[in-house]
Interface confidence: medium
């Protein structure tokens, strides 16, 4: 519900939010040489432009346009991963996995992850008080914008056998609501993606529970199959053991870690 | 104020050793990247080494490659490079260079450089 | 590499007159829409200074006489109207592609 004072029920932009997006473009950059030539002077004036002098609740994708152009990227289409309120185990195995990508590994997700922004209508400032909640204020607000159009991209850009990394300890393992189930699942291109093979993290240590007969499970397989995408599922029970695992493939308790149940 | 005070240079024989120092002060090094140029007399500039803010990406022009090694220490804000295996060629005053904060590959603030000689 | 070639090596300008240095490249340093050519000031005795960044872009406390234009292969470094103080050699320097290369310097003086 647009308020006449702009008062909102979300925290404010993030402190020192321009120096911070351009501090991590120049280190993004300094990092991944293929993306050097990147004018991050630019690309912040692109960030602002999509939301400054903008009433929070009325951002669009086409705002975020100049942005993208500038953020362009190409990633290994085959080494995706997608994940779902799991992000710190998905950030740390693609850590070790250099090979593989997260949103958050591109520049334009590694320049907004964690961040707040937003900004006021006819103003040129940036609202450090408080900036809408997707829930109690209006969804077309800056952050879940950007947020919708960069997953949306980074879903349609994905080819081969796509991963999902999904919360074994959530009551909704698949959730329709979560930018995965509302963006990225519906942007995969079934005549690119072959395969969605979901990992579902177990929490506790003593769940051996086949977490790939999940009811929200099936619902996610019952989406990909009709749009003609394969499915399978893994169980990963020990996600520490996982990880020391693709850190220390040739280890000989390693064979077993990720039970297999494929669902086609 | 920016400032970039270079030291370590020399008189030194082909082959051997010397490690240059970049002192810095008047900005937050840690936020930089950071650049070894080299002039030799009578000379125009060459790009010789270049570190990022962290220390993560690290580029060496090809006539330097596999003899100098560029470091830093952010804690202290100092740059270094140690030179090896030096030829009568690598003799230049090696100038410091902060990269310019928005983008790779050139160069807002200079010191006034060190001198180089290798010669037997 | 890329080879940056400058003409002339030297240029002698009346105060007050227009001083053009140019900048040829061996291959395009375009990027992103981006011309990474810059140019630098070298007093005697001193360091190099910024003066134009990506080609067009005048650094912060450099005079409004100093202007750069071009892309692709081709730039210039123009001095509206020289003034003593502009006595100096000037390089032009690329960061499209490493290893960063530089120009051999044009040196401009008073005639």
């Known amino acids: 519900v647009p308020r006449w004072r702009q008062q909102w029920s979300g925290p404010g932009t993030t402190k020192r939010f321009p120096e911070t997006v351009l501090a991590r473009c120049v280190k993004y950059t300094e990092i991944h040489p293929e993306m050097r030539h990147v004018d991050c002077q630019s690309v912040w004036d692109a960030f602002k432009g999509a939301f400054i002098s903008k009433h929070p609740c009325n951002i669009t994708e086409e705002d975020y346009q100049p942005l993208m152009k500038l953020g362009t990227q190409t990633v290994p289409c085959n080494k995706i991963l997608l994940w779902s309120r799991i992000k710190d185990l998905a950030h740390q195995f693609t850590q070790v996995q250099r090979d593989m990508f997260t949103l958050e590994d591109t520049l334009l997700g590694y320049l907004a992850d964690d961040l707040t922004w937003c900004g006021e209508f006819n103003t040129s400032k940036i609202n450090y008080q408080s900036c809408p909640d997707w829930r109690k204020d209006c969804s077309n607000n800056p952050v879940s914008v950007f947020w919708k159009t960069v997953s949306r991209r980074f879903a349609e850009a994905a080819c081969d056998v796509v991963h999902v990394m999904l919360n074994g300890s959530r009551s909704k393992i698949f959730d329709k609501n979560s930018t995965f189930g509302s963006v990225e699942v519906h942007n995969l291109q079934p005549e690119k993606v072959q395969t969605l093979e979901a990992w579902v993290i177990h929490g506790g240590r003593e769940d051996s529970r086949d977490l790939c007969q999940d009811p929200t499970i099936k619902e996610l397989e019952s989406i990909i199959s009709k749009r003609n995408i394969q499915f399978s599922c893994k169980n990963i029970y020990r996600p520490d053991k996982f990880l020391q695992c693709v850190k220390n493939p040739e280890d000989s308790s390693c064979t077993s870690e990720i039970h297999h149940h494929h669902h086609h | 104020e920016v400032q970039l005070v270079e030291s370590g240079g020399g008189l030194v024989q082909p082959g051997g050793s010397l490690r240059l120092s970049c002192a810095a002060s008047?900005?937050?090094?840690?936020?930089?990247?950071m650049h070894w140029v080299r002039q030799a007399p009578g000379k125009g500039l060459e790009w010789v080494a270049f570190?990022?803010?962290?220390?993560?990406?690290?580029y060496y022009a090809d006539t330097v490659k596999g003899r100098f090694t560029i470091s830093r220490d952010n804690a202290k804000s100092s740059l270094f490079l140690q030179m090896t295996s030096l030829r009568a060629e690598d003799t230049a005053v090696y100038s410091c260079?902060?990269?310019?904060?928005?983008?790779?590959?050139?160069?807002?603030?200079w010191g006034q450089g060190t001198t180089v000689t290798v010669s037997s | 590499d890329i080879v940056m070639t400058q003409s002339p090596d030297s240029l002698a300008v009346s105060l007050g007159e227009r001083a053009t240095i140019n900048c040829r490249a061996s291959?395009?340093?375009?990027?992103?829409?981006?011309?990474?050519m810059h140019w630098y000031q070298q007093k005697p005795g001193q360091p190099p200074k910024l003066l134009i960044y990506r080609a067009s872009n005048l650094e912060s406390g450099i005079p409004d006489r100093f202007s750069g234009s071009g892309s692709r292969t081709d730039f210039t470094l123009t001095i509206s109207s020289l003034q003593a103080e502009d006595v100096a050699t000037y390089y032009c320097?690329?960061?499209?592609?490493?290893?960063?290369?530089f120009g051999g310097g044009t040196k401009v003086e008073i005639k």
């Open positions: 570190i990022s803010s962290g220390s993560s990406s690290i």
């Open positions: 260079a902060r990269n310019y904060v928005s983008s790779y590959g050139y160069f807002d603030y």
């Open positions: 008047g900005f937050t090094f840690s936020d930089y990247g």
């Open positions: 291959e395009n340093v375009d990027n992103y829409g981006i011309s990474f």
């Open positions: 320097q690329q960061s499209n592609k490493d290893p960063l290369t």
